[in-house]
Interface confidence: low
């Protein structure tokens, strides 16, 4: 299963596979998921250690049970890989580190303006893997504004310092957001030439290509398959990159097939593992486990669910099989790939499906109406669950937000659809940022269900919740995902960094904005919130956000949209945009409901309605 | 194949120690675990702890934390577990148990240890 | 520490009829639970584990099912070598704990 809580002040002994330099335990936690073997780390920040070697450590490690001793070390943190963990599971890194120098090799020097100037040339240059830029105020004037992009033999900091008026990042090119574009081409019969960075197994090119994508120093492959003239070459898929970023030649080859890497691919990015399953195949590694099931996909859905297990084959051999059920070889190695890979066989094999970001519809557990004023544009991925509500009766227009929780559930407020309660008026618009990106031919969803709170009544505070169920599930990606929901019964008082966003007005009397807002916005307690709302009766079930000084708040638009707060490096939903007394007032927080008081209620409704739990929230 | 093989019964005085043996082959003996697990007479299994070959690392469960001591010779691919300050309640059969996955796949004979003035 | 408490203690059957054991864990174990099979003299053999897991040399016949808290053995059809003591065990968090033993004797 997903395990996502992070573990203070401890550190796991023994087990190692892999260690790097990485800026803070959520960047380690990463590099754990998608290496092949990693299913836990320990990460060792500045503050906790004294040997400068080992400031920054990120300690990848492996067991066998599962788990390993955990030794009390002040200041470490550790946790588990997020292998399993469905959407939860990206190579994208936003976070800006500053007062750090991230060392590498630096082979591109200019200037820019700011640190986000210098983290989009990182994302546009072929070759960059992370960046340091040096402030206005860097102690040394003529490297002042100074933008190096950077890349290491693995993809991490050779060396990590602590730095004043230094901020460091790495690419945004796993997030999609690059600039650059992608050769999808596959070239047939045709061998790269250039530097070999590493070697695999594969089935296929395909294959080939997305461990090219996600490994951190290919630029493109070759592969040779299974007919290749020279026996021992056979699936052998080569990992490549050059000083250009582009291959300096290549040479027409019988039985070999060639193309790139998919990382500088804008807005879509292949799933960093592979489904297909190949008939006639055996697949090679260390025995894991060996099992008895009935077909090859239940095999699969076995070597899935065991952690470890990284590829499988499922025999059909007669000795192999009892009654309906087959052995089931479940197998691992070094790298993630096949020792071996042999065809004519009365097997087939094939992958597990641990690192697919569609995942289970279960996978959200503990990891990671009213235009927003004061806030600032998002970005493109920042928050992926946030949708937007329109009603297409004349013309279209935006009315509320929403937020995804599941493949085909939205959360919004009950309030949204008063007066307009008919599902056929709705569109529902995800991963998107600009309003003005939505023409005829952008993709929408439509409304299968509307469910609302049975004790809602229009024109008053309580209850203003509602689930949406979709007609059809959407896929995740690096733009559309679903935010996790909170353990039932969560105090708020845990929560110190929480966000709002939305396209509502900008001021009380203002209009829908285009670009998505967000606004980093406090929580109030219940006492100080009812102070402030001597006419109405704020309740348990409410959660209160805002400035004294206001200033900053959702508006009109803004209803139904989320109120997330991130803790211990995972984003949840806890409040949503419910109302408040005009917008931004001083000393009138926003209202919210709030979402851990309808736990039972959600699972409940997105249970009953298939008979299947569709999302899960922390345990 | 994997083969566990622990060394002979031992009779001990309480406040004594005992150290039990237990020699792995079959397989690399540094990729796997080593748990140990015992069995009181007439008794269910109760869980001590393991050892990590490889790193030396240990994991040991708390009811025995300060008694118990595993340690590993990976010239002779043999574990060891050591009990200290024995009481006529630690008499039981001790076992060796390697796992498959998560489980214990691979056990060994098991050795009596008897706690007797 | 998670708690496992097997039932019945103890069950007398004939060869042919279908035996069930039942293991409640005092919290949600999430699937992680192995059966053991033991002879009277001999070290536990793994019988069941995890989801689907039958271990190698163990008929068709046994089969495990369950999820959260409550988890059940199956023997279909009881043979004389299938008179044993069995054991369920969670691995899903230390310290690994077993519950106290279910004896499957001859009626």
């Known amino acids: 299963g997903c395990l996502t809580q992070l573990y203070e002040n401890a550190f796991f002994r023994g087990g190692d596979v892999a260690s790097m330099y990485t800026p803070n335990a959520q960047y380690c936690q990463m590099r754990c998921t998608f290496h092949p073997r990693c299913l836990l780390f320990s990460f060792l920040p500045a503050s906790s250690i004294n040997d400068m070697e080992k400031r920054f450590g990120c300690f990848l490690k492996d067991s066998v049970t599962g788990t390993l001793p955990k030794v009390h070390r002040t200041g470490a943190v550790s946790g588990h890989s997020l292998k399993q963990c469905g959407h939860q599971i990206s190579a994208c890194h936003r976070d800006i580190y500053k007062g750090v120098d991230m060392r590498g090799v630096n082979f591109n020097v200019s200037k820019v303006s700011s640190v986000e100037e210098c983290q989009k040339r990182c994302t546009s240059n072929i070759r960059c893997q992370f960046f340091s830029y040096a402030t206005q105020t860097f102690h040394k004037a003529e490297y002042r504004n100074n933008c190096l992009l950077k890349y290491s033999p693995g993809g991490t900091p050779t060396a990590i310092k602590v730095l004043s008026n230094v901020e460091s990042g790495f690419s945004l090119k796993p997030c999609a957001l690059s600039e650059i574009g992608c050769h999808m081409n596959i070239f047939q019969h045709l061998a790269f030439s250039d530097v070999d960075v590493a070697r695999v197994l594969t089935p296929d090119a395909f294959v080939c290509r997305t461990i090219c994508t996600y490994h951190p120093n290919c630029l493109f492959f070759t592969f040779y398959t299974n007919v290749w003239k020279i026996e021992s070459q056979r699936n052998v898929c080569l990992l490549k990159t050059s000083e250009s970023g582009t291959p300096s030649s290549s040479t027409p080859q019988e039985n070999t097939i060639s193309g790139y890497s998919l990382l500088t691919c804008k807005r879509t990015l292949p799933e960093p593992c592979h489904s297909k399953i190949y008939p006639g195949v055996d697949f090679g590694g260390e025995e894991l486990n060996v099992t008895f099931v009935k077909g090859v996909n239940v095999c699969q859905e076995t070597c899935t669910k065991m952690i470890r297990c990284q590829f499988f084959t499922y025999s059909l051999l007669p000795e192999d099989c009892k009654e309906e059920k087959c052995k089931c070889f479940l197998r691992l190695s070094m790298d993630g790939s096949p020792t071996r890979i042999a065809y004519g066989t009365q097997g087939s094999s094939g992958y597990s499906l641990r690192l697919c970001n569609t995942g289970d519809n279960s996978v959200c557990t503990t990891k990671t109406s009213t235009r927003i004023v004061g806030g600032t544009n998002s970005s493109w991925g920042e928050w992926p669950w946030q949708v937007s509500l329109q009603v297409k009766l004349t013309a279209q227009r935006h009315l509320c937000g929403g937020s995804l929780i599941g493949h085909q559930w939205v959360l919004t407020a009950a309030h949204c659809f008063d007066g307009l309660p008919l599902q056929d008026v709705w569109r529902i618009y995800s991963g998107i940022l600009n309003l003005s990106d939505i023409t005829k031919d952008t993709p929408f969803s439509q409304i299968k269900e509307i469910i609302i709170h049975q004790n809602y009544k229009v024109s008053e505070g309580n209850h203003d919740i509602a689930l949406i169920k979709l007609q059809a599930p959407l896929n995740y990606t690096e733009f559309q995902k679903p935010i996790c929901l909170p353990s039932k019964g969560d105090t708020s008082t845990i929560y110190t960094n929480c966000w709002v966003t939305g396209w509502g007005f900008s001021k009380e009397k203002g209009e829908i904005q285009n670009i998505l807002q967000k606004v980093n916005i406090p929580l109030v307690t219940n006492e100080e919130c009812q102070k402030r709302y001597q006419d109405y009766k704020i309740t348990q079930r409410m959660v209160c956000a805002g400035y004294k000084e206001g200033g900053k708040d959702a508006c009109k638009g803004d209803s139904g949209g989320p109120l997330v707060c991130k803790h211990n490096g995972m984003w949840r939903l806890v409040g949503i945009t419910s109302w408040g007394e005009g917008c931004a007032r001083r000393e009138q927080p926003g209202v919210y409901t709030k979402v851990a008081e309808y736990m039972d209620w959600i699972l409940e409704k997105t249970q009953s309605s298939d008979g299947k739990a569709q999302m899960q929230s922390p345990a | 194949q994997v083969q566990l093989v622990q060394s002979g019964a031992e009779v001990k005085k309480p406040g004594a120690s005992v150290k039990v043996s237990c020699k792995a082959s079959?397989?690399?003996?540094?990729?796997?675990?080593m748990h140990w697990v015992r069995q009181a007479p007439g008794l269910g299994l109760e869980w001590m702890g393991a050892?990590?070959?490889?790193?030396?690392?240990?994991a040991y469960n708390q009811k025995f934390k300060g008694r118990v001591t595993m340690t590993r010779d990976t010239s002779t691919s043999t574990v060891y577990m050591e009990l200290s300050s024995l009481r006529s309640e630690d008499t039981a059969v001790y076992y060796c148990?390697?796992?498959?996955?998560?489980?214990?796949?691979?056990w060994g004979q098991g050795t009596l240890v008897t706690v007797s003035s | 520490d998670i708690q496992m408490t097997q039932s019945p203690s103890s069950l007398s059957a004939s060869v042919g009829e279908r035996v069930t054991i039942t293991c409640k864990a005092s919290?949600?174990?999430?699937?992680?639970l192995a059966w053991y099979q033991q002879k009277p003299g001999k070290a536990p053999k793994l019988l069941l584990y995890?989801?689907?897991g039958l271990e190698a040399g163990f008929h068709l016949r046994f089969s495990g099912s369950g999820s959260g808290t409550h988890y059940t053995l199956t023997i279909s059809s009881l043979q004389p070598e299938d008179f044993a003591t069995y054991y369920c065990q969670q691995y899903w968090s230390t310290p690994w704990t077993f519950g106290q033993g279910t004896k499957v004797e001859i009626k």
């Open positions: 995890g989801e689907t």
């Open positions: 079959g397989y690399t003996f540094t990729d796997y675990e």
């Open positions: 919290e949600d174990i999430y699937n992680r």
């Open positions: 148990a390697r796992p498959y996955g998560y489980p214990f796949a691979y």
């Open positions: 050892i990590h070959p490889g790193s030396g690392g240990t």
